[in-house]
Structure formats: C-alpha cells, structure tokens
C-alpha cells in the first residue's frame, strides 16, 4: 500500500508534468505559427520591396536613356544654327579647336579630318594675331597645317597653296631633311620648323556656319 | 502487487510521454531560435532593400529634374542664333573665355563683368572635367570665381553660394590670411588657394544664348 501510494504520487507528478509540457508545446506551437506568419509577412515585404526596386531600376534606366537622347538631340539641334560646334572657338569666318592630346603631325591631321576640319591655316596677319593671342597662356607647341617634303620643296598648306613670305618667318630646323618631312608648329607666337614625326598639340580649323539664322 | 505493476506500467508510459514531450520542446526551441535568426536576417534584408529603394528614388528624382531641364532647354534652343560671342568657347549651357592678360583677382573679376560675365564657377565634376581639358596645354594659373575673406570664413562663389567639398580638394595656402583675401586658381587641373593680390590669367563664364529668336 505504501509502494502504491508512492507510485500514485509519482504518477500524479508525472501527469502534472506531462500536462504542463503539453501546455508548453501548445503555447510554442501557437508562437511558432505566429512566427511563421510573421516570417511570411517579412518575406512578402521583401518580395514587394525587391519588385519595387526592380521597377525603379527599370524606370531609372528608361529615364537615363531619355536623358541621353535629349542631350544628343540638344547637341544636334543647337549645332544647326550655331556658327561652331561645342568646345570650338568662333573667330571671324572660322571655328578653331585646340587639341587636348599630343600626336605627330600626320596623326594630328587625321584627328582634324575626323572632325570635318583641317589643321590650322593662317591667311592673314589678323589670323596670326588671333592665334598668337589664343595660345598666349600656353608654352606648348601646336602643329599647324604647313609642311614641306624637304628643303628643296616650298612650304605648302594642306590645301596645296603656298605660304606667303610676308606672314611670318620660320625659325628652327628650316634647312634640315627628315624622312617624314618638315612640319611647322606655332609656340609662344613664333613659328618653327621641326621633324613631322614628333608629338605636339595641334589646332584644327573649319569654316564657321554663318548661314542666315 | 497487480496494482503496483499497473501503476509502474502507467508510470513508464508517462515517463516515456514526458521524455517525448521534452524532446519535442527542445526541438521546437531550436526551431524557434533558428526562426528568430532567420527573422533577423529578413529584417536586415528589408532594411537594405528599403535603403536602396530610397537611394534609387533620389537618383530617379534627380534624373527626372535633369530631364525636365533638358526638355525646357530643347524648347528654347530651336532657331537660336550664336550661343556665344566670337572668341568664346561654347560648352553645354555656358560660354567660356580664357583671358589673354594677367591680372589680380579683383581686376580679373572686373574684366569679366565688363563682358557681361563672371569668373568661372564649377558646379559639377563634368564642368571640372571640361575646364581641366580646356587648360591641359597650359602650365599657367587661371583665377576662378571662388574666394574667402579669410580662413575663418567659408569658400564662396561670386554669386554667394558655398563651395561643395566633394567637387575638388584645394591645395596651396588654404589656411593663410591675406589682407586682400584668399582666392582660388586652377592650374594643371588642380585647384589652389592663393593671395588675391597676385596676377594670373582668368576664365570668364556666362550663360550661352539658347533662347528662341
């Protein structure tokens, strides 16, 4: 009987513990369900945000393309009536571009051609004055469109016309013969003869668009 | 004894059930911790996505404004005459003139004003890139429209707007006090602080004429 009572007591304890554990499990189950629900909500929120971000990126890409198109159009439209393209200097009847890269004479010539222009040609003392002033804050040499095959040939501009002797006197290697020819550059207002193979800045020139606006 | 056996059997069952329940609770506890960790990761992900979305929105807003401005400019541009006077460089919305004389900052400012312009103001890294390229063949300093009364005053542009520190870092005499103030010049692509009384070349700037005629 004593053993019986002891067993009954233990059984009561175990039943109580079991009920308590079942209660805990039930509570945890509810908490788990709530947590699961919360997780689902969070996942849903992430999905929504990711979708929104993707949409925004698409819209932004579209706006960016629109922007580029507008800029392109703006450049084209503006260039229609402007005497010179952007970044060129308009002076009298011409547009001038001071190159930002240093190349040999032939390469400089190609660069100008690709911009529908030619290397600088000086037709008058007024032209020379303008150029001298425009490069007055530079100590670098600038190729111009003047060259000769060797000293037994005359100095010619790119269009084949000869240099008029009254415009300027050429300093430097005037009597030298170079395999690549002799080319002229302007530096600090003076014109020099040099080996065409050397690298220098350059000045491109083209006619200004002076049609009636 | 029979009762005893029965009770023992029940007790064994209960103990087994209790152990089983405890195992379940332990498993649920681990699952709960994992779920909590997962929830924290999800929340962090949400935070990141929300931040990215906010950044995208800001960028989009900026692009949208740029777009509107470009459309506005495009409307004005149709049938316009020369955007800039002779000898000036037209770039984007502005005209630039590189002075051919060397003066102190105040005198340079006056020269620009007499041409209905102001000293150079750099608003963006794109502006800075253009100017750096345009003066790449010069080793001389050029005054810009940036100055400060002394180092206990902020850097201001001529129009009174403050310099944004991300545009460029200023070299030279940044912390020095000069009676005539401290002014900024650009040289070989870098910006320097110097005594405003010194002579330098300068860059004038004014809005390009992109209005409809």
């Amino acid at each position: 009987s004593q053993v019986s009572n002891l067993l009954k007591q233990q059984q009561t304890n175990l039943t109580h513990q079991k009920n308590k554990l079942e209660g805990q499990i039930s509570a945890r189950q509810q908490a788990e369900e709530a947590s699961q629900e919360s997780q689902n909500e969070l996942k849903e929120m992430i999905e929504t945000l990711a979708w929104k971000l993707n949409e925004k990126s698409k819209e932004q890409m579209e706006l960016h393309h629109q922007n580029l198109n507008l800029q392109e159009t703006l450049k084209r439209v503006a260039n229609c009536s402007a005497p010179c393209p952007q970044d060129w200097i308009w002076h009298e009847e011409n547009c001038y571009l001071f190159s930002t890269g240093s190349f040999n004479w032939e390469k400089s010539q190609e660069k100008c051609l690709s911009l529908d222009a030619k290397l600088l040609k000086i037709n008058s003392t007024a032209d020379l004055d303008f150029i001298q002033q425009a490069i007055s804050y530079s100590s670098f040499p600038f190729w111009m469109g003047l060259s000769r095959r060797n000293p037994s040939y005359p100095w010619l501009w790119e269009d084949g016309s000869p240099l008029m002797p009254h415009l300027f006197r050429i300093r430097g290697a005037v009597s030298q013969t170079y395999p690549s020819g002799t080319c002229a550059y302007i530096q600090r207002g003076a014109v020099y003869a040099e080996n065409c193979i050397l690298a220098a800045f350059s000045i491109c020139q083209k006619k200004a668009n002076l049609r009636a606006q | 004894s029979q009762v005893s056996n029965l009770l023992k059997q029940q007790q064994t069952n209960l103990t087994h059930q209790k152990n089983k329940l405890e195992g379940q609770i332990s498993a649920r506890q681990q699952a709960e911790e994992a779920s909590q960790e997962s929830q924290n990761e999800l929340k962090e992900m949400i935070e990141t996505l929300a931040w990215k979305l906010n950044e995208k929105s800001k960028e989009q807003m900026e692009l949208h404004h740029q777009n509107l401005n470009l459309q506005e400019t495009l409307k004005r541009v149709a049938n316009c005459s020369a955007p800039c006077p002779q000898d000036w460089i037209w770039h984007e919305e502005n005209c630039y003139l590189f002075s051919t004389g060397s003066f102190n900052w105040e005198k340079s400012q006056e020269k620009c004003l007499s041409l209905d312009a102001k000293l150079l103001k750099i608003n963006s890294t794109a502006d800075l890139d253009f100017i750096q390229q345009a003066i790449s063949y010069s080793s001389f300093p050029f005054w810009m429209g940036l100055s400060r009364r002394n180092p206990s005053y902020p850097w201001l542009w001529e129009d009174g707007s403050p310099l944004m520190p991300h545009l460029f870092r200023i070299r030279g005499a940044v912390s020095q006090t000069y009676p005539s103030g401290t002014c900024a010049y650009i040289q070989r692509g870098a910006v320097y602080a110097e005594n405003c009384i010194l002579a330098a070349f300068s860059i004038c700037q004014k809005k390009a004429n992109l209005r409809a005629q």
């Epitope: - | 180092p151 206990s152 005053y153 902020p154 403050p162 944004m164 520190p165 991300h166 870092r169 200023i170 070299r171 030279g172 005499a173 940044v174 912390s175 020095q176 870098a190 320097y192 005594n195």
Partner: antibody, heavy 115, light 107 residues
C-alpha cells in the same frame, strides 16, 4: 610614395622650447600645407596650425599664438614646429600632417615636459 | 570656433554588427567634415572626407552621411581590425576642430 618622417622624442624642462621637424617626400612639398596636431596622453586631437611651404606663411590657433612658430626649409622639404615657454600640460604627441583633409600623417613625436 | 560633439564616447559591439557614430557641429558646416581612425600608438588615418567620400584604399564597409550640422559614420559589418578611436573634424573654417573621439571596442 608620400611620407612624412618626424624627429625623435624629446624631454624638456618647464619654460624651455622644443623644435620638432617633419621631413616630407613623395610629393611636391610646396603645393600642400603642413598641419600640426597634438594629442595629450589619453586625450583627443587638437589642431595647432599650419604652414604653407610655398610662401612660408603660417596660421596658428589663438591658444598657441605667441608661443608657436612654424617654419620650413624647402631645400630639404622639411617643416618645423617650435613651441616655447613649455608647461607640463604641453606633454603630448605632436603630429605633422599634409593637406586638408589630412591625408598623410607623420609617425608622431612625443614631447615630455617635466621638472 | 565651431564645436564638434561626438556620440557615443565609447561603443562596444560584436564582429559583424552595424556600428553608427554621430558627430554634431555647433553650426552648419555644409559637408566639410572628415572622419579619422586612430589605433593605439599610431597616427590617425583618413577614412572619409566631404562627409561621405571614401578615401582610396579604405574598405567599403565604412560610409558617411549627413548634412548641415549632423553627420554619421557607419561601419556596416564590424571587423576585428576596426577596433580604434574615431574622430570627426570640420575643415570648413579655422580653427579646424575635432570631435572628442569615440572609442570602439569588441564585445
């Protein structure tokens, strides 16, 4: 690469002067200001002033005015900071640094002022 | 003079944590703000300038934000090598003043 190398630690008596040097290399010395910053033991950073090596002009914090002198020798690309009438609370590590914001720093010079 | 106030004065965090340090100026400084990192016995190192520009060579887990008078330095995922004292400094006008520093420790 850019480097700023400072002179070694100093122990001075109150009332004395100390001159710390900062030798620059790896960049054009005259282009960038040299700043001086000090840090007392266990304390924060304190800007003392700057010198423009190009012109030799210097700017000092009011607190140090009259006690500090910043000079330079462009021939050896070296900046100097001299602090006179030393007090015990001048005990600190003195740093030289280049430009604003200060992108390169010297290793620091410990100046101990003690009787 | 412009006063710079940093908070907190010290912070303890675990590896991988997101850490935020704030800096308040007594007047608007228009983003003329720098963050430096200083390890014991070493000279300070430039982390960010112009409030949010990362100095080259600095890990991308460091970022800065803010405007006007209030600025923040954020370490997105704390690494053991980030243990140091962090200082903000305004460089808008002289005297160029520093914050009092924030000591960052590992939990």
């Amino acid at each position: 690469q850019v480097q700023l190398v400072q002179s070694g630690a100093e122990v001075k008596k109150p009332g004395a002067s100390v001159k710390v040097s900062c030798k620059a290399s790896g960049y054009t010395f005259t282009d960038y200001e040299v700043h001086w910053v000090r840090q007392a033991p266990g304390q924060g950073l304190e800007w003392m002033g700057a010198i423009h090596p190009g012109s030799g002009g210097a700017a000092y914090v009011q607190k140090f005015q009259g006690r500090v002198t910043m000079t330079r020798d462009t021939s050896i690309s070296t900046a100097y900071m001299e602090l006179s009438r030393l007090r015990s609370d001048d005990t600190a590590v003195y740093y030289c640094a280049r430009w604003l914001p200060m992108d390169y720093w010297g290793q620091g010079t410990l100046v101990t002022v003690s009787s | 003079d412009i006063q710079m106030t940093q908070s907190p004065s010290s912070v303890s965090a675990s590896v991988g944590d997101r850490v935020t340090i704030t800096c308040r100026a007594s007047q608007g400084i228009n983003n003329w703000l720098v963050w430096y990192q200083q390890k014991p016995g070493k000279a300070p190192k430039l982390l960010l300038y112009a409030a949010s520009r990362l100095e080259s060579g600095v890990p991308s887990r460091f970022s800065g934000s803010g405007s006007g008078t209030d600025y923040t330095l954020t370490i997105s995922s704390l690494q053991p090598e980030d243990i140091a004292t962090y200082y903000c400094q305004q460089y808008l006008i002289t005297p160029y003043t520093f914050g009092q520093g924030t000591k960052l420790e590992i939990k």
